[in-house]
């Protein structure tokens, strides 16, 4: 399937001009290669009329141009002074020959329709209303007023001043006069449909002295806006239906032959195909709203329509807006699994992609919630503290410049299962959707911390060890101290030459962390984890409480003393100086404001690595929002 996209049908009138926009995938080669517009002949040959190389055919001389917009990945063909001879089949495309990537465009140029100059013309969009003005002479003021619609043979009554109304206009048509003006009457018709289009006659009086006026009512279907989006990226449908439907339920549907299947509405309906990757957001009181879909799939391509009606379903005679969505399969967004699997008590490390050109953008992770219109409250971000209920078990690791940041969630429970979005404050196309599945653990965790009852005494030495299996032998092991701003990896350096070993003793693989002397600042969550380069793997967490020597209380007044930690990897002794100052002995991110919800986010379904048989709980209470439980092991 060609990744070039444009309008399938273009219609115009003799003498007018058209502009045809064609979209191409975002690659350097495409931006610089030849663009062309050619006309298809009966033989299948496509004759170039204009190209970006500067070629211009004789018949287009002085009336056409082709402009490339590399920043938008589009090129535009402008043709002026159209004649009926321009009607035909064309291609817009890329490549050195006209057999390259292309899109078929049909152009139809019609004759100029002239109208009688006494015609009153009204042009209205579907679903709107029209007020037709019908002037008459003063002598016809007492006479009957009426509006009828012309059919082949006759003129069918719509409404008259004796309150007769055609059944198909009941509740929609009103005949009235304004103030004391006795020379004009008005007919208002609401909820206009295609069937209302046509010629009408308004009349005051009877016989030869009657006042008659020809009225031409055009009811316009909305022109679909073309949207060109990459596979796995996101799309936002911005729907502006006007103040008159501000209080009605809103919907987005996708055309399916003759019907339009609702994908989402503000009454809570949602197509299961879009579970976890769609939000609908009312914008204001003027009937504006938006629908965001992430994780675009090729089957999402098609014709979309938004509208408003109390039923939340498409209804004739109500305002609509339409789009034609094209999903480009030559996507710049990396293809990753869309499901991460973890086990209870274990951990997952999710690699979130972002546009590598925007390494300084703020990164976020939010949890999609389907209730109501759908929303995505931020759980963690580069400048957003971790939500309180995720204390000690969620962190975001930014790796500037490589196009990926990692979100780690440990101490998993089945309640963590659901959909999560990776997003940044930069290029919205790179938002990705991950489904997290959490199964009950059936085996021992890969990482285990001892002792599990972790209470350190102020001023003394305290060591915790993290046991890992042989399969992690070649990976980098680390300890980090968690705070609601991230997990600060404790610096370490080798002090002795490490013995190379071919065999691996399952019982002796451990990485230890020593706090010496224990300071009250050392209280908090610590993670033991493995990683390979910038690729994070499993983690496990432990809460270390700090008590004074004489009392059992774990509450300590803060001081500025820096903690000292030693991290020992197998036989090596690693000294690491921790100088993390925290305001509280137990990190508390404070209430996480709901305003931080990212409501209009989501772009592409994707996912990342997770450990299949992920690491373990450490015996701590996992009700992380209840900090006092941490000390009763």
């Amino acid at each position: 399937k060609s990744p070039i996209f444009g309008p399938q049908e273009v219609s115009s009138i003799e003498g007018d001009s058209v502009s045809i926009t064609c979209y191409y995938p975002d690659t350097s080669v495409n931006r610089h290669t030849r663009k062309y517009w050619c006309r298809q002949g009966a033989s299948g040959m496509c004759t170039t009329l204009i190209s970006s190389n500067g070629y211009l055919s004789k018949e287009y001389s002085g009336r056409a141009n082709l402009i490339n917009f590399p920043e938008n990945n589009t090129f535009v063909i402008n043709i002026e002074q159209l004649t009926q001879d321009d009607t035909g089949s064309y291609k817009c495309g890329l490549g050195t020959s006209n057999r390259g990537l292309s899109f078929d465009v049909s152009l139809e140029v019609s004759q100029v329709p002239e109208l009688p100059s006494d015609t009153h013309v009204y042009t209205k969009d579907i679903g709107r209303n029209v007020t037709i003005e019908c002037p008459f002479k003063r002598e016809n003021a007492p006479s009957k007023k009426s509006l009828c619609k012309k059919t082949n043979q006759s003129c069918e009554l719509v409404i008259d001043s004796t309150e007769k109304v055609n059944p198909s206009y009941i509740g929609r048509a009103k005949l009235f006069m304004k103030g004391t003006d006795l020379t004009v009457f008005y007919v208002n018709i609401s909820h206009l449909t295609h069937n209302d289009a046509g010629l009408y006659i308004c009349q005051a009086g009877e016989g030869p002295s009657a006042d008659k006026k020809n009225v031409d009512l055009q009811v316009l279907a909305p022109e679909p806006e073309l949207l060109y989006k990459d596979l796995r990226s996101s799309v936002t449908f911005e729907c502006d239906l006007g103040r008159e439907v501000a209080n009605e339920a809103k919907y987005l549907c996708r055309m399916n032959k003759e019907t339009c299947d609702v994908i989402i509405n503000t009454l809570g309906k949602r197509d299961p195909d879009f579970e976890g990757r769609i939000l609908i957001t009312p914008k204001d009181d003027n009937g504006r709203f938006s629908v965001l879909i992430t994780g675009l799939r090729k089957e999402d391509a098609g014709h979309y329509q938004c509208g408003a009606h109390s039923s939340g379903l498409p209804q004739e005679g109500w305002p609509i807006q339409t789009w034609q969505l094209f999903v480009n399969e030559e996507s710049t967004i990396p293809n990753r699994r869309s499901v991460v699997k973890g086990v209870t008590g274990g951990s997952v490390a999710i690699a979130c992609p972002y546009n590598p050109k925007e390494s300084s953008s703020l990164k976020y992770w939010c949890r999609w919630e389907g209730d109501g219109n759908g929303h995505c409250p931020v759980l963690v971000g580069t400048q957003a503290q971790v939500q309180e209920e995720y204390e000690g078990r969620l962190a975001l690791f930014d790796q500037p410049g490589n196009g990926t940041y990692t979100v780690i969630l440990n101490q998993l429970t089945t309640e963590d299962a659901g959909f999560y979005w990776c997003l940044t404050n930069g290029d919205s196309r790179w938002r990705t959707t991950i489904e997290l599945q959490v199964a009950e653990a059936t085996r021992e965790p890969n990482l285990e911390v001892t002792p599990q009852n972790a209470t350190a005494v102020l001023g003394e030495t305290f060591t915790v060890s993290c046991h890992y299996p042989c399969k992690f032998y070649s990976q980098e092991k680390y300890w980090c101290k968690w705070s609601n701003k991230g997990c600060h990896i404790l610096p370490s350096h080798d002090e002795g030459a490490r013995q190379s070993s071919v065999s691996c003793d399952q019982s002796s693989q451990l990485v230890s962390m020593t706090l010496n002397p224990v300071s009250k600042e050392d209280e908090g969550w610590y993670w033991c984890g493995v990683k390979q380069g910038q690729t994070y793997g499993e983690t496990t967490a432990i809460y270390i409480a700090v008590e004074e020597r004489t009392r059992g209380s774990s509450h300590v007044n803060p001081t500025d003393a820096n903690a000292r930690a030693k991290v020992a990897l197998e036989e090596e002794v690693v000294d690491s100086s921790i100088s993390e100052k925290e305001n509280k002995a137990i990190p508390n991110p404070g209430p996480f404001a709901n305003e931080r919800e990212i409501q209009n986010v989501g772009d592409q379904a994707q996912e990342n690595r997770a450990s299949g048989d992920a690491g373990s709980a450490d015996g701590q209470s996992r009700s992380s929002s209840s900090k006092h439980h941490h000390h009763h092991h």
Partner: nanobody
């Protein structure tokens, strides 16, 4: 709110041609009728030509029929008035206006107006 800007006026000899442009901003002209009117000193404002944007149907006043052509460019949201075989009596300020509906030829049906562009025809 629609803003209209006319251009293309100027001095031309009788029998010559001019092309006036009316560029609209603020919103698409899709559901409007766009008309050209003219007003010579001491005279009433007079209808010249109009086009229904949605389907291109047009009306041209009898005095200019066959000489003046109204056309549109969707992408530029612009309407043109091609004036050929100009006569001294065509000299006037030409105004562009848009309407949501009503009588093509009646100026009161038009809601938004441009500032006008002067056309002078010398004999």
């Amino acid at each position: 709110e629609v803003q209209l800007v006319e251009s293309g006026g100027g001095l031309v000899q009788a029998g010559g041609s001019l092309r006036l442009s009316c560029a609209a901003s603020g919103r698409t002209l899709r559901s409007y009728i766009v008309g050209w009117f003219r007003q010579a000193p001491g005279k009433e404002r007079e209808f010249v030509a109009a086009v229904t944007w949605s389907d291109g149907r047009r009306v041209t006043a009898d005095p200019v029929k066959g000489r003046f052509t109204i056309s549109r460019d969707n992408a530029k949201n612009t309407v043109y008035l091609q004036m050929d075989s100009l006569k001294p009596e065509d000299a006037a300020v030409y105004y562009c206006a848009v309407s949501h509906g009503g009588a093509y030829v009646e100026s009161r049906a038009y809601e938004y107006w441009g500032q006008g562009t002067q056309v002078t025809v010398s004999s």
